[in-house]
Interface confidence: low
Amino acid sequence: RAPRCRELPAQKWWHTGALYRIGDLQAFQGHGSGNLAGLKGRLDYLSSLKVKGLVLGPLHKNQKDDVAQTDLLQIDPNFGSKEDFDNLLQSAKKKSIRVILDLTPNYRGENLWFSTQVDSVATKVKDALEFWLQAGVDGFQVRDIENLKDASSFLAEWENITKGFSEDRLLIAGTNSSDLQQIVSLLESNKDLLLTSSYLSDSSFTGEHTKSLVTQYLNATGNRWCSWSLSQAGLLTSFLPAQLLRLYQLMLFTLPGTPVFSYGDEIGLKAAALPGQPVEAPVMLWDESSFPDIPGAVSANMTVKGQSEDPGSLLSLFRQLSDQRSKERSLLHGDFHTFSSGPGLFSYIRHWDQNERFLVVLNFGDVGLSAGLQASDLPASASLPTKADLVLSTQPGREEGSPLELERLKLEPHEGLLLRFPYVA
């Protein structure tokens, strides 16, 4: 008799793929045409990335540092009208993209939570949650929660409202903290909260250090669902050396949890790479005309359009990874096991029951390395085969689909490999 299939875990929509943050509508759309009507036109692009949710805004009226002139129920007319927002929600729904609204109150000001009137602001947030849930949003994000006194209890209250409306709604909290104790204490009182932090960016970016960061985090948070990002709002390029961008994309998409990206991460957009751009919200490079003030400042290989046409680009890698992440059971909700490999490497397996299994090998080093995979510390349920098929490499030159002998596996500098192999009873 065939072994019984393992029962599938309950899957929420945010478990099924990546979230994509658009913190600045105008910068994302470029050319000054940054309104909700225009964003509706970018949804096909988001579909092509296979992201599951769009973390949008803030969009509400906010007079810098003025509580009285901050209205969490009103969309700033610069972004459009409630009708435009409603149209966006309808279009996103048709394309199976969920919309999460950022309600960080004082987003134009110094202290995102108005340092002096935290309680009245928190009350405003409560009303806003009710209002926007009725309007049809799929969840909320609040950032800089370390600046919110008694953050845990506020978050618990907001999560109750969100989940009380529907278990299918999500609350995301962001913090600049990279301290694991602090992160765990924020998570303790909130069972379904997704927390983005600077935890992974406080790294020496070596294989060993990254492995220990990931395993410590997973151990500390127990069996709860995680999210993976390098910060609560910034671009990957602001935290990573350029040569590790592809490696981190591969890692974020294959760790157990929800990967969270910012607009532009998929093309390697750099903060303030071009003259006159604000650091926190660089203009998205759609095509070579995206930066009209300085002709020639943008080359095709920096843009969405250019990278779409290049199968070896970062964007193509992102699309491939996102596709795998959203359809393979082992990557969707599989178990996670790290194991020993050569110095400078971080290697792990994702597996679920009798489904195809995935092996990830990441070389953080500046030199080519032998993988040196040692499966002795893997449980019997996750043993390694002698060969595995290459799904993708972060570097050009390897043939996708080709079988690789794991004992002889060598990696190029900064190369990451995603390999697949079948379950064997």
């Epitope: 045409s33 009507a37 096909d44 692009y45 048709k94 394309k95």
Partner: antibody, heavy 119, light 107 residues
Amino acid sequence: QVQLQQSGAELVRPGVSVKISCKASGYTFTDYAMHWVKQSHAKSLEWIGVISTYYGDTTYNQKFKDKATMTVDKSSSTAYLELARLTSEDSAIYYCARVWLLSYAMDNWGQGTSVTVSS
Amino acid sequence: DIVMTQSQRFMSTSVGDGVRITCKASQNVRTAVAWYQQKPGQSPKALINLAPNRHTGVPDRFTARGSGTDFTLTISNVQSEDLADYFCLQHWNYPLTFGAGTKLELK
């Protein structure tokens, strides 16, 4: 090179419908949305609407909501505009024009299809 | 709807001269204005897809300026092949709207 080839001129009676086509070549059809524009002597250029070639979802100018229906056939890289209950007011040249990722202006236009409504 | 006003329906010029065609939006459209050239019996041709970006292959004697509500298309050193209708288009918000057009003729 990029081409948008529209169907030939139509002479039709009032009250009937007409469906005009716009066949795209020289680029990946689903990378660009398709706009439709009306040009008449009386009203110059008027935007009818835009259709996403990827999903087929549409945004119409309210003025044409009950008059025009935009569709696409991805397999033949063709966009269609159907005009219903024609009157002499609908006599005009109708253009298809492609746009990359919807929020830019149209960059390439078809040669136009002349529709004349006359009894 | 946003109204795009091209106040001059006709403009006269001579070959070699410069000319400025204006377009005014009824509300703030940032820089989301495109310009098209149309010759008799032909379809419109993209000149500027967004102030001040020239479309591929458009000669640099065509320049566009403006943001907010006031926009201009300048043609320096006018050539005989530039005699045509010129339309502005706002693509800031739906419905997209065109100006009525300005016809450039020889004096």
